[in-house]
């Protein structure tokens, strides 16, 4: 039975040209995290694997940095980076947990962080 929950940074906004940290945290489970995939829509951004370390997908190498922790840092943000991001936790024995973050990249300097929220 899947008992865990994923806490994410929720709906967030950032300035064009700036950077942002995407964070997810899996709690309330003793499941072993085998791998975390970061995806934007259906595109693979990055992988963090317990045995093999980090991998940043070739098309994002220039603007994506691993960490902190299992999170992901997006740099040199453009308006095209606006959209949904998913952290997909592959765990044993529970299975797969998915967290969702919505990022809005703003032209002006009025970007503010949204509230944190949970996905069961």
């Amino acid at each position: 039975m899947m008992t865990g929950t994923i806490e994410t940074t929720g709906n967030i906004s950032a300035e064009k040209g700036g950077s942002i940290i995407l964070q997810c945290h899996l709690s309330s489970t003793t499941a072993q995290v085998t791998q975390v995939n970061w995806e934007q829509q259906d595109q693979l951004l990055a992988i963090c694997n317990a045995d093999l370390g980090w991998h940043i997908s070739p098309s994002f190498k220039d603007r994506v940095a691993p960490g902190p922790g299992l999170g992901l840092t997006l740099q040199s943000l453009t308006v095209n980076d606006t959209g949904e991001y998913f952290c997909i936790y592959h765990t044993y024995p529970d299975g797969t947990y998915t967290g969702r973050i919505f990022l809005e990249v703003l032209e002006s300097s009025v970007a503010e962080h949204g509230a944190r929220f949970q996905i069961p």
Partner: antibody, heavy 120, light 110 residues
Framework: EVQLLESGGGLVQPGGSLRLSCAAS????????MSWVRQAPGKGLEWVSL????????YYADSVKGRFTISRDNSKNTLYLQMNSLRAEDTAVYYC?????????????WGQGTTVTVSS | QSVLTQPLSASGTPGQRVTISCSGV????????VSWYQQLPGTAPKLLIY???QRPSGVPDRFSGSKSGTSASLAISGLQSEDEADYYC???????????FGGGTKLTVL
């Protein structure tokens, strides 16, 4: 079409060397962990070696450790296996295989194999 | 000697259900995922089951995988003559840090 095509097999004398290649097509090669698996005549499958996405983490079966080296050239979409100090027991069909995006899940795509014969 | 243990052979008649077992230890099957492969004579292996119980697209639902403790099993229901092949289980071993295979099971359809 997703495809793996091995080459470089042949007849070699004991103590000799051989380099196998595996050309990948139809998928983003950089995003996948790769392995070599071999099968001696009339025998079962034996895993040989594994390499992560950019080649900075490699693992080997005890039977080939110190003699074989796995590597990859992502710019050429090619996986390699350098085999040195070859022995009669290395005679086998060598397959390259792609791991599932979560590499521990399994090997989802296999090449057709290339035959290595070690004999004097 | 393979790290994972499978029966050397199994058999069944058309339409029957056949189960192939795969036994490991606490550092592989018990805490990791299992995958199963079918190898028809003279061909490369083909993935049948990944993540212990999931089927890749194109694999008939006659094939199913399960796992309990240090053992896993592959079940084939509605056995057909074209299922005659060698079947292998495999898992990542956390202690050895290596990909371990079973010795293979030759399935004969009588």
């Amino acid at each position: 079409e997703v495809q793996l095509l091995e080459s470089g097999g042949g007849l070699v004398q004991p103590g000799g060397s051989l380099r196998l290649s595996c050309a990948a097509s139809g998928f983003t090669f950089d995003d996948y962990v790769m392995s070599w698996v071999r099968q001696a005549p009339g025998k079962g499958l034996e895993w040989v070696s594994l390499i992560n996405w950019n080649g900075d983490k490699t693992y080997y079966a005890d039977s080939v450790k110190g003699r074989f080296t796995i590597s990859r050239d992502n710019s050429k979409n090619t996986l390699y296996l350098q085999m040195n100090s070859l022995r009669a027991e290395d005679t086998a069909v060598y397959y390259c295989a792609r791991h599932w995006i979560v590499f521990q899940y399994g090997l989802d795509i296999w090449g057709q194999g290339t035959t290595v014969t070690v004999s004097s | 000697q393979s790290v994972l243990t499978q029966p050397l052979s199994a058999s069944g008649t058309p339409g029957q259900r056949v189960t192939i077992s795969c036994s490991g230890v606490s550092s592989n099957i018990e805490i990791k995922y299992v995958s199963w492969y079918q190898q028809l004579p003279g061909t490369a292996p083909k993935l049948l089951i990944y993540n212990s119980h999931q089927r890749p697209s194109g694999v008939p639902d006659r094939f199913s995988g399960s796992k309990s403790g240090t053992s896993a099993s592959l079940a084939i229901s509605g056995l057909q003559s074209e299922d005659e092949a060698d079947y292998y289980c495999t898992s990542w071993d956390d202690r050895l840090k290596s990909w371990v295979f079973g010795g293979g099971t030759k399935l004969t359809v009588l």
